[in-house]
Interface confidence: medium
């Protein structure tokens, strides 16, 4: 069956200066290939953090994606500015050249309140 | 406080056709997401559709995929179902249900409408 | 698809005495899990949101365990007005959103 990326949260609040985890879980890890998160959609949309040796400033893996049968991508992102709010979303890929996009969990928007 | 008036409900005929509406009031109805689930008659609850605040995000059942459609006219706090090539075992009360803002649980639930299709 | 299994599907049992409802998830919906109580004539009413959370306005009779695969809903001493039929949900997968297929608690 398909892999599925699964975003059980539809919103999360923040107050700015705190931090807040942004989960999402595969319910496989096949086909091969990376995990990234991106805010927004289509050609705009901004790489957040990629389960790679790539280093995210304020933005980091709440799970170890390096143990071979963990599906838990959340990420965690310190530190929130009012420039952080945005739809997230945790996107499959399937590895080649170059890597395709296989699929996409539903979105989590994120609300970032004043302190 | 929280209301959701389901109506539209009636006896039709296999094939034919129907329009629920479900009118909301005591909340920001723009802000959430809505729902229509059914019951049929001595059945346990099913989910029919989903439809965001904005309007831009759709779900349909695999049941009722392609012949209902799901619509909401936030100036007018209100949500429809049209129902379309209806068929017996669409048969049940029909309730409109308020999403919570965070999950997609209900919060809160309108009392129904019945569709009965007989012929 | 997620499939729940509500068990049982009838609990006959007296004013005061405990109920136990079982909630069973085909695959791990860690705590994504809501209850609900339905009467005749009535809307369906939320009980239960996050496998234990009580919903506002709920009497504290009612509670909730689990995560993952199980779950339970427990009406400690059961009042007239709790003989009902009870249903869980899951929302941790994107819809479609299931339910259980219910569990009657009726009066003995």
């Known amino acids: 069956t398909e892999v599925k990326v699964i975003q059980p949260e539809k919103s999360v609040s923040v107050a700015a200066g705190d931090s807040t985890v942004l989960n999402c879980t595969l319910t496989s890890l096949l086909p091969v290939g990376p995990i990234r998160w991106y805010r927004g959609v289509g050609q705009s949309r901004q790489l957040i953090y990629s389960f790679t040796t790539e280093h995210f400033p304020r933005v980091t893996n709440v799970s170890d994606a390096t143990k071979r049968s963990n599906l838990d991508f959340s990420i965690r992102i310190s530190n929130v500015t009012p420039e952080d709010a945005g739809t997230y979303y945790c996107v499959k890929f399937q590895r080649g050249s170059p890597d395709t996009e296989i699929q996409s969990g539903g979105g989590t928007e994120v609300y970032v309140l004043a302190k | 406080d929280v209301q959701l008036v389901e109506s539209g409900g009636g006896v039709v005929r296999p094939g034919e056709s129907l329009r629920l509406s479900c009118a909301a009031s005591?909340?920001?109805?723009?802000?959430?997401?809505m729902n229509w689930v059914r019951q049929a008659p001595g059945e346990g609850l099913e989910w029919v559709s989903l439809?965001?605040?904005?309007?831009?995000?759709?779900y349909y059942a695999d049941s009722v995929k392609g012949r209902f459609t799901i619509s909401r006219d936030n100036s007018k706090n209100t949500l429809y179902l049209q129902m379309n090539s209806l068929r017996a075992e669409d048969t049940a009360v029909y309730y409109c249900?308020?999403?919570?803002?965070?999950?997609?649980?209900?919060?809160?639930w309108g009392l129904g409408t019945l569709v009965t299709v007989s012929s | 698809e997620t499939v729940l299994t509500q068990s049982p599907g009838t609990l006959t049992l007296s004013p005061g005495e405990r109920a136990t409802l079982t909630c069973r998830a085909s695959?791990?919906?860690?705590?994504?899990l809501a209850w609900y109580q339905e009467k005749p004539g009535q809307a369906p009413r939320l009980l239960i949101y996050g496998a234990s959370s009580r919903a506002t306005g709920i009497p504290d009779r009612f509670s909730g365990s689990g995560s993952g695969t199980e779950f339970t809903l427990t009406i400690s001493s059961l009042q007239s007005e709790d003989f009902a039929v009870y249903y869980c949900?899951?929302?941790?997968?994107?819809?479609?959103?299931?339910f259980g297929g219910g569990t009657k608690v009726e009066i003995k």
């Open positions: 949900q899951q929302y941790y997968d994107r819809p479609p959103l299931t």
């Open positions: 439809i965001s605040g904005s309007g831009e995000i759709i």
């Open positions: 005591g909340f920001t109805f723009s802000s959430y997401d």
């Open positions: 695959q791990s919906v860690y705590t994504y």
């Open positions: 249900a308020k999403e919570n803002n965070r999950y997609r649980f209900f919060d809160d």
